[in-house]
């Protein structure tokens, strides 16, 4: 079974800068899975942000504009990355990755 690790416990960024979060997949080939990213803002329910499927197709939360969150995967390091562009106060949250084994 696949296992996920998010090595960064926290990330502090200056407003308008870029934040890059990592999710390391082990126990399964990342190219054979779909990785999902969610966020939980203080006092709010968890929210789906974006996913990247085994074939590379990206799907995002339709209510969030393109260009805000960028998801990628690096097979060589078995890592999925979530890049948050132009960091703002409403991006303060806990971000989670999740795995869907195909």
């Amino acid at each position: 079974a696949g296992h996920l690790e998010q090595p960064q416990i926290s990330s502090t960024k200056t407003l308008s800068k870029t934040a890059r979060l990592e999710c390391v997949v082990s126990g399964i080939t990342i190219s054979a899975t779909s990785v999902y990213w969610y966020r939980e803002r203080p006092g709010e329910v968890i929210q789906f942000l974006v996913s990247i499927s085994y074939d590379g197709t990206v799907r995002k939360e339709s209510g969030i504009p393109s260009g805000k969150f960028e998801v990628d995967r690096i097979p060589e390091t078995s890592t999925s990355t979530l890049t948050i562009h132009n960091v703002e106060k409403q991006d303060i949250a806990t971000y989670y990755c999740a795995l869907w084994e195909v």
Epitope: R59, I64, P65, S66, G67, K68, E88
Partner: antibody
Framework: EVQLVESGGGLVKPGGSLRLSCAAS????????LTWVRQAPGKGLEWVSS????????FYADSVKGRFTISRDNAKNSLYLQMNSLRAEDTAVYYC???????????WGQGTTVTVSS | EIVMTQSPGTLSLSPGERATLSCRAS???????LAWFQQKPGQAPRRLIY???SRATGIPDRFSGSGSGTDFTLTISRLEPEDFAVYYC?????????FGGGTKVEIK
């Protein structure tokens, strides 16, 4: 069927203002982020602005920042673009478009023409 | 800002021929965030391809996209009369979203 209908274009003098509207139907308007894109006469496409479903995220192209304001009214299924301090280089056809789960510009309106001239 | 450059500016071909349109990004773009659009005179653009290679709903399979990094290609395997139009590439991985300058495919 998804429909986007822009209105509000017209002729305006440099320094003037105009408010564009985009009336939407055929989809869950309040769940989608939306965009404005423009096309100057005989030129290519230029992204202008985007707004999230709840209006919490708003982005602008540098060329319009501080002059244009994007907004939406989910109760009226409408998107707006308030354009102030208009310049000749803002002359273009303005399109509204959806920004769905598979990326932006999946559905487009027919466009409304803005001409800035003295 | 990621600058998208398309070539050639104009492509003169006959119906039935193969069209190959190029798009180059000024910095690396994830292939998941590259789209192609078609625009005919007096009409709004229409999305053909998203994610560099996935066809949008209702797009014929003679249209195909490929590429990664900074170099992307749109191929029309056999040009039909209705395919003569202007084509734009666009990246949507990061704001500002940027379009290429377009390639006009005209009848030879």
């Amino acid at each position: 069927e998804v429909q986007l209908v822009e209105s509000g274009g017209g002729l305006v003098k440099p320094g003037g203002s105009l408010r564009l509207s985009c009336a939407a139907s055929g989809f869950a308007f309040s769940s989608y982020s939306l965009t404005w894109v423009r096309q100057a006469p005989g030129k290519g496409l230029e992204w202008v602005s985007s707004i999230s479903s709840s209006s919490s995220y708003i982005f602008y192209a540098d060329s319009v920042k501080g002059r244009f304001t994007i907004s939406r009214d989910n109760a009226k299924n409408s998107l707006y673009l308030q354009m102030n301090s208009l310049r000749a280089e803002d002359t273009a056809v303005y399109y509204c478009a959806t920004d769905g789960e598979l990326g932006p510009f999946d559905y487009w309106g027919q466009g409304t023409t803005v001409t800035v001239s003295s | 800002e990621i600058v998208m450059t398309q070539s050639p500016g104009t492509l003169s071909l006959s119906p039935g021929e193969r069209a190959t349109l190029s798009c180059r990004a000024s910095q690396s773009v994830s292939s998941s965030y590259l789209a192609w659009f078609q625009q005919k005179p007096g009409q709004a653009p229409r999305r053909l391809i998203y994610g560099a290679s996935s066809r949008a709903t209702g797009i014929p399979d003679r249209f195909s996209g490929s590429g990664s990094g900074t170099d992307f290609t749109l191929t029309i395997s056999r040009l039909e009369p209705e395919d003569f139009a202007v084509y734009y590439c666009q990246q949507y991985g990061r704001s500002p979203l940027t379009f290429g300058g377009g390639t006009k495919v005209e009848i030879k």
